[in-house]
């Protein structure tokens, strides 16, 4: 399975409206950042298998999307925006699943890398857990918008490799 | 298999040091959250601490905190529990175990080592 | 704190019934309820998790119910190897908590 160029775009669609969420000067928030630990290791592609990449992309998509649709994230951000936002996260979604069914029995290896995506889900247990000590400030959240703005970022790359590989 | 090998039983006095382990094997050691559960004898369990080994962030149960410390060795898969100075209150049966994490990152705990006794006294 | 209050502290069964043994939190925890049995001189082990959930290979006279502040385990068919201290334990908050322990006997 290739991910379609609509893929791509839903990634850089995904971004601009992250980019276009901000309220706030990230500059007003210096104070309030902390280091989540993003698994950057799980995201570099050059031990994967494709199936697995693809769990990986999965989960972390599917945690951003469950972070975002909680009520203290309706209370936060313009709810124009959100909905935009889950429709591109939702269409990422579909391309991995759609991917995914297509590599089953394709590769010997197990289609989903549990310790990988375990990773994933601690890095975001970790995001949820500074969210609530801080309250749900908006600092927190301008710091944690940041935060899924870069992990996007860095995951574009695998997204990008997983796209072009044969 | 996921196995969580502990050390055997410590006998010390009040003030001394001391630090236990748990070898795990049979997993990616990096991917769970380890945690240390006490239960002084013929009483509860009590959570006191977790770890991420993949880059040692921790978070301590208050009543835990500053009287025990938690480290990991990647190099050994091993996740140790340390105190500088043991206090007679100390005497329990430490166990550590793995978590979980559900999609809806709900932690529990799937895996236990054997436990470890340690018994304080002079 | 959230604190767990089991009920009852101990009760006594024969091979063959039916128990159940209710936990309490002292604030809605969800679903972050988990049981656990400990038999003597063993460690504890995971029986169900996120309230309802079998884990791998623990038989299915275990079942687990309830959400928010309550939560039940039941046991059908005691077998003998069932006697022994059940936890309830929530990882909704931190520190993670568990209840007392309910001590089930022989009758």
């Known amino acids: 399975c290739d991910l379609p160029q609509t893929h791509s775009l839903s990634n850089r669609r995904t971004l601009m409206i992250m980019a276009q969420m901000g309220r706030i000067s990230p500059f007003s928030c210096l104070k309030d950042r902390h280091d989540f630990g993003f698994p950057q290791e799980e995201f570099d592609g050059n031990q994967f298998q494709k199936a697995q990449a693809i769990s990986v992309l999965h989960e972390m998509i599917q945690q951003t999307f469950n972070l975002f649709s909680t009520k203290d994230s309706s209370a936060t951000w313009d709810e124009t925006l959100l909905d935009k936002f889950y429709t591109e996260l939702y269409q990422q979604l579909n391309d991995l699943e759609a991917c995914m069914m297509q590599e089953v029995g394709v590769e010997d290896t197990p289609l989903m890398n549990v310790d990988s995506i375990l990773t994933v889900r601690k890095y975001f247990q970790r995001i949820t857990l500074y969210l609530t000590e801080k309250k749900y400030s908006p600092c927190a959240w301008e710091v944690v918008r940041a935060e899924i703005m870069r992990s996007f970022s860095l995951s574009a790359n695998l997204q990008e490799r997983l796209r072009r590989k044969e | 298999e996921v196995q969580l090998v502990q050390a055997g039983a410590e006998v010390k006095a009040p003030g001394e040091s001391l630090r236990i382990s748990c070898k795990v094997s049979?997993?990616?050691?990096?991917?769970?959250?380890i945690s240390w559960v006490r239960q002084i004898p013929g009483k509860g369990l009590e959570w006191m601490v977790k770890?991420?080994?993949?880059?040692?962030?921790?978070i301590y149960n208050p009543s835990f905190q500053g009287h025990v410390s938690i480290s990991v060795d990647k190099s050994i898969t091993t996740v140790y529990l340390q105190w500088s100075s043991l206090q007679a209150s100390d005497t329990a049966i430490y166990y550590c175990?793995?978590?979980?994490?559900?999609?809806?990152?709900?932690?529990?705990?799937?895996?236990w080592g054997q436990g470890t006794l340690v018994a304080v006294s002079s | 704190d959230i604190q767990m209050t089991q009920s009852p502290s101990s009760l006594s069964a024969s091979v063959g019934d039916s128990v159940t043994i209710t936990c309490r939190a002292s604030?809605?925890?969800?679903?972050?309820f988990h049981w656990y049995r400990q038999k003597p001189g063993k460690a504890p082990e995971l029986l169900i998790y996120?309230?309802?959930n079998l884990q791998t290979g623990v038989p299915s006279r275990f079942t687990g119910s309830g959400s928010g502040t309550e939560c039940t385990l039941t046991i059908t068919s005691l077998q003998p190897d069932d006697f022994a201290t059940y936890y309830c334990?929530?990882?909704?908050?931190?520190?993670?908590?568990f209840g007392q322990g309910t001590k089930l006997d022989v009758r």
């Open positions: 175990v793995r978590h979980y994490l559900t999609q809806s990152l709900v932690d529990y705990f799937d895996h």
């Open positions: 049979g997993y990616t050691f990096t991917s769970y959250w």
């Open positions: 770890i991420d080994p993949r880059d040692s962030y921790t």
């Open positions: 604030q809605s925890v969800s679903n972050y």
């Open positions: 996120s309230a309802s």
């Open positions: 334990q929530q990882t909704h908050g931190y520190p993670f908590t």
